[in-house]
Amino acid sequence: MNGRVDYLVTEEEINLTRGPSGLGFNIVGGTDQQYVSNDSGIYVSRIKENGAAALDGRLQEGDKILSVNGQDLKNLLHQDAVDLFRNAGYAVSLRVQHRLQVQNGPIGHRGEGDPSG
């Protein structure tokens, strides 16, 4: 029996203060570099150790960044997205989407007290 994998999607506003070495993360994605099938969105690919994002602790690798300082990141070329972050100023507000994987038990084998779904 295969377990079913579900995803819990949440959104969060994260305010970062640019540190001595910047914001401290990498991105992938864009209309010219789709990282997720049928999605040209911008994703966090790496959080740099001891950078502003790592020290804040909320931004995670794999998060989708929806907007920067209120500016939507839809339908942007990869480099245009990069430039948007680089020019975002000292205080940077990110709207992000976290996608948490939730592993459910094998289908048809519900333990006592499990919701019947």
Epitope: G22, N26, I27, D32, H78, F85
Partner: nanobody
Framework: DVQLVESGGGLVQPGGSVRVSCVSS????????IGWFRQAPGKEREGVSC???????YYVDSVKGRFTISRDNAKNTVYLQMNSLKPEDTAVYYC????????????????????WGQGTQVTVS
């Protein structure tokens, strides 16, 4: 596990050419920035050239017009073609890989990289 292996260095005469290669394994090259850096004896490691995750090439001023970076994603390899070599190009050449694009600086910044090869010696003499 990310692995980078450089090859192709050697002894070259001034004005000559050499091509160094960086073969990667353990990851899909398409989404990575790859940088070439060099370190001469007694000097700090410096950026030479890099190619970002969407294929844009960058060069330091001292090698512009002489060096050319290219990538072959199918072969998981990045090349640095070095022409019109000068004695001051003598160094150990390293490649490095970084997943995605830094939102802080270009791929010429060696502080952005976590994964490095072991280096290949190029001597111009």
């Amino acid at each position: 596990d990310v692995q980078l292996v450089e090859s192709g260095g050697g002894l070259v005469q001034p004005g000559g050419s050499v091509r160094v290669s960086c073969v990667s394994s353990g990851f899909i090259l398409d989404y990575y920035a790859i940088g070439w850096f060099r370190q001469a004896p007694g000097k700090e490691r410096e950026g030479v050239s890099c190619i970002d995750s969407v294929g844009r090439a960058y060069y330091v001023d001292s090698v512009k017009g002489r060096f050319t970076i290219s990538r072959d994603n199918a072969k998981n390899t990045v090349y640095l073609q070095m022409n019109s070599l000068k004695p001051e190009d003598t160094a150990v050449y390293y490649c490095a890989a970084d997943f995605g694009s830094s939102v802080d600086s270009t791929c010429l910044n060696n502080q952005q990289y976590d994964d490095w090869g072991q280096g290949t010696q190029v001597t111009v003499s």
